[in-house]
């Protein structure tokens, strides 16, 4: 059974946030994705979405937040750039299904976005500059703004049993601590 | 240590198919995306698709949309790769390949590869 | 599709000899670019991750440099056990691509 999980990032400011969500491609590849922050007892709240219907690898900008729905894989990218650290926070994908409530994607992204100098060697500051070099479309937030009452908004539980660490050879630049946490099972 | 270990040479007819598996093990195997490359003999690398392991999403290059099931058994962490409709420029070595960072990050490094699987597909 | 070039396709060089190949991406691809090792009949290893970070366990006279749309292996000192083939891989996008490789073999 699919377990829903938070992975977490670790990154200083002025870094890029580069994750994927992905989605079953027969039923979603055209649907209208979006990129919300949790913050706990409100509401999801939307910060940037794909156009409706959503066009396959076409940058969409909305302010430091570009999305790029990759139709052909099932993949949706989504790339926070020049990170501060009220960026800090729970994020999740979700894919817009009126009317019925958004269809959640694993897995939710908890950000910490800590003060410091990010330009060591092998820092993702560089991939700032990626961003910008194809003119995105900036949009305004044209998202539907409905979200499920049901979306679980709580911390997921402390227990340590089921949370799997990075192998310890892993070097990932930056990204200095993935933990998946399950939220529930 | 983290260990991919794939299923033995096939030889298939044309039009046949074939379906390698891919064992996981020393890493939590739903936390990382499985891809698969293949090479040519004397050619080079061809990336053909990924699957997310967790959600049992994946998706695949366009030459080989219409002929490629990526699925995996989380129970005994195998991803298997099918490829259809074989003809003869499928001959290769297969590989699966674990990427260097968790499922969500977009940080395609391939890190952790298979030994490869021959395919031979000759009439 | 990201087009992505080696050059040379192959090359004879000496034990200690500096050795360096490059690898050019069709439009910019920012600092996204893999380099890997493939000894005959083996698979890939890699080498180097986000043009220029070393992996975990490769000797230090492997480096990579670049950003945008060129890129440089280097091997600072070759050894025998260097002899391999070696590829450029980038992950701007999707479809990921890879170089046609790179032949090194000892003069």
């Known amino acids: 059974a699919t377990k829903l999980t938070e992975e977490k990032y670790e990154l200083k400011e002025g870094q890029t946030l580069d994750v994927k969500c992905d989605y079953t491609l027969e039923k979603f590849a055209s649907s209208q994705k979006a990129w919300q922050i949790i913050r706990d007892g409100e509401m999801p709240k939307t910060l940037a979405c794909t156009e409706r219907p959503s066009k396959n690898s076409h940058p969409v900008q909305v302010g430091r937040i570009i999305l790029e729905d990759y139709h052909d894989h099932g993949l949706l990218r989504v790339r926070m750039v020049n990170l501060q650290v009220e960026d800090s926070g729970l994020y999740q994908c979700v894919i817009y299904q009126p009317p019925k409530e958004p269809h959640m994607l694993f897995d939710r992204i908890r950000l910490v976005v800590t003060k410091g100098f990010s330009g060591t060697p092998g820092s993702n500051e560089n991939s700032t500059q990626n961003v910008y070099k194809i003119p995105p479309t900036t949009t305004k937030a044209l998202c539907p703004l409905y979200t499920s009452p049901r979306t679980v908004t709580q911390a997921p539980p402390k227990s340590t049993a089921d949370v799997s660490t990075p192998d310890s050879e892993i070097n990932l630049t930056n990204v200095t601590d993935i933990i998946r946490v399950p939220v529930f099972n | 240590q983290v260990q991919l270990v794939q299923s033995g040479a096939e030889v298939k007819k044309p039009g046949a198919s074939v379906k390698v598996s891919c064992k996981a093990s020393?890493?939590?195997?739903?936390?990382?995306?499985i891809n698969w490359v293949r090479q040519a003999t004397g050619q080079g690398l061809e990336w053909m698709g990924w699957?997310?392991?967790?959600?049992?999403?994946?998706g695949s290059v366009k030459k080989f949309r219409d002929r490629v099931t990526m699925t995996r058994d989380t129970s005994i962490s195998t991803a298997y790769m099918e490829l259809s409709s074989l003809r003869s420029e499928d001959t290769a070595v297969y590989y699966c390949?674990?990427?260097?960072?968790?499922?969500?990050?977009?940080?395609?490094?391939?890190?952790?590869w298979g030994q490869g699987t021959l395919v031979t597909v000759s009439s | 599709d990201i087009q992505m070039t080696q050059s040379p396709s192959s090359l004879s060089a000496s034990v200690g000899d500096r050795v360096t190949i490059t690898c050019q991406a069709s439009?910019?691809?920012?600092?996204?670019l893999n380099w890997y090792q493939q000894k005959p009949g083996k698979a890939p290893k890699l080498l180097i991750y986000?043009?220029?970070n070393l992996e975990t366990g490769v000797p230090s006279r492997f480096s990579g440099s670049g950003s945008g749309t060129d890129f440089t292996f280097t091997i600072s000192s070759l050894q025998p056990e260097d002899i391999a083939t070696y590829y450029c891989?980038?992950?701007?996008?999707?479809?990921?691509?890879f170089g046609q490789g790179t032949r090194l073999e000892i003069k």
């Open positions: 699957m997310n392991p967790n959600s049992g999403n994946s």
């Open positions: 020393g890493y939590t195997f739903t936390s990382y995306d």
């Open positions: 986000d043009a220029s």
């Open positions: 439009r910019d691809i920012s600092k996204y």
């Open positions: 891989q980038h992950y701007d996008n999707i479809p990921i691509t």
């Open positions: 390949v674990r990427l260097i960072g968790y499922s969500s990050a977009f940080k395609w490094s391939f890190q952790h």
